[in-house]
């Protein structure tokens, strides 16, 4: 009686159980009553990562530099290529199918957390007493200059984008 189900690493075809092709190989022809399943290795830049009955291997993933990607791990006949982001870029999702340049913090904002390969720059507004006058992915808010410690006085108040301007103390004339 013909089987209705097959063992693991087998598949049912024409009322008989044939062996699946091992990872790294594709199906050329099904088994028959007299012959085994015929499989062939995947070609260069191709892979299959499971026991299968695929007639075509999959192309290795292309790590597109236009999307900020580079090869982290080269693929084999049994594994796909793994991409990661170029330096200064981060993934747009956990699967990392594309990357974008790290965000810079605008003047008036400082870097709270420097970006990584999987997370973007986190910016924070410069609080009173601090400033940032540059657009940067690294610079934190800087404290206003302390005029007093230099024996000077504040001539122009600081903002979140500018430092204070210090000047000499007005001497009282006799």
């Amino acid at each position: 009686e013909p089987p209705t189900a097959c063992r693991e690493k087998q598949y049912l075809i024409n009322s008989q159980c044939c062996s699946l092709c091992q990872p790294g190989q594709k199906l050329v022809s099904d088994c028959t009553e007299f012959t085994e399943t015929e499989c062939l290795p995947c070609g260069e830049s191709e892979f299959l990562d499971t026991w299968n009955r695929e007639t075509h291997c999959h192309q290795h993933k292309y790590c597109d530099p236009n999307l900020g990607l580079r090869v982290q791990q080269k693929g084999t006949s049994e594994t796909d290529t793994i991409c990661t982001c170029e330096e200064g870029w981060h993934c747009t999702s956990e699967a990392c199918e594309s990357c974008v340049l790290h965000r810079s913090c605008s003047p008036g904002f400082g870097v709270k957390q420097i970006a990584t390969g999987v997370s973007d720059t986190i910016c924070e507004p410069c609080p009173v007493g601090f400033f940032s006058n540059v657009s940067s992915a690294f610079e934190k808010c800087h404290p206003w200059t302390s005029c007093e410690t230099k024996d000077l006085v504040v001539q122009q108040a600081g903002t979140n984008k500018t430092d204070v301007v210090c000047g000499p103390q007005d001497r009282l004339r006799a």
Partner: antibody, heavy 116, light 108 residues
Framework: EVTVKESGPVLVKPTETLTLTCTVS????????VSWIRQPPGKALEWLGG???????YYASWAKSRLTISRDTNLKQVVLTMTNMDPVDTATYYC??????????WGQGTLVTVSS | AFQLTQSPSSLSASVGDRVTITCQAS??????LAWYQQKPGKPPKLLIV???NLASGVPSRFSGSGSGTDFTLTISSLQPEDFATYYC??????????FGGGTKVEIK
């Protein structure tokens, strides 16, 4: 050859649930995500959501409550279900290769009409 | 909610004209912007990725620029086959994956 193809009903009644299937070939769903995008007649493209190569599902904020996207890597299929269909959901529904990324490979699209 | 505003919504131009379409994001998306061309009854075709990089097989008369919130698609010399609708798309994150409203380029 790398292809993606949508299939499902062409006519859905209001309040019913739409189920569309995207069948892929030439690539593995473990390597690439798939997204769903729709386009009402004469209107702009709308991103509905997608599923990443790692199996994470993502949804447009306005559609989150009505959408489910799932996949079967062995069958090479990604399934979109959209509940409580309304005539304003009449559109051409596309699947495209990629999760949160750009879409270089699109299906031909399937026109779904919502009408009683 | 995150938005992409495309302008103009339509424009008339002649063959050989220089055409510029803009796309503005409601918050910074760095370089996470793509441009597509769509013709009636067809799926969109990818033109530009990463705000300024030409997709494979796209003619060099197309170019993209911008970063952060303001982006531009330029067609340096409009050809008969370029009359179509153009869309921008952001892909900075899942919460900002959105298409613009489209720009229809018509024959003057």
């Amino acid at each position: 050859e790398v292809t993606v193809k949508e299939s499902g009903p062409v006519l859905v009644k209001p309040t019913e649930t739409l189920t569309l299937t995207c069948t892929v070939s030439g690539f593995s769903l473990s390597s690439y995500g798939v997204s769903w995008i729709r386009q009402p007649p004469g209107k702009a493209l709308e991103w509905l959501g997608g599923i990443g190569s790692d199996g994470s599902a993502y949804y447009a904020s306005w559609a989150k409550s009505r959408l489910t996207i799932s996949r079967d890597t062995n069958l090479k299929q990604v399934v979109l279900t959209m509940t409580n269909m309304d005539p304003v959901d009449t559109a051409t529904y596309y699947c495209a290769r990629g999760g949160i990324t750009v879409y270089a490979m699109w299906g031909q699209g399937t026109l779904v009409t919502v009408s009683s | 909610a995150f938005q992409l505003t495309q302008s103009p919504s339509s424009l008339s131009a002649s063959v050989g004209d220089r055409v510029t379409i803009t796309c503005q994001a409601s918050q910074s998306i760095s370089t996470g912007l793509a441009w597509y061309q769509q013709k009636p009854g067809k799926p969109p075709k990818l033109l530009i990725v990463g705000a300024s990089n030409l997709a494979s097989g796209v003619p060099s008369r197309f170019s993209g620029s911008g970063s952060g919130t303001d982006f531009t698609l330029t067609i340096s010399s409009l050809q008969p086959e370029d009359f179509a609708t153009y869309y921008c798309q952001s892909y900075f994150s899942s919460s900002s994956t959105v298409f613009g409203g489209g720009t229809k380029v018509e024959i003057k």
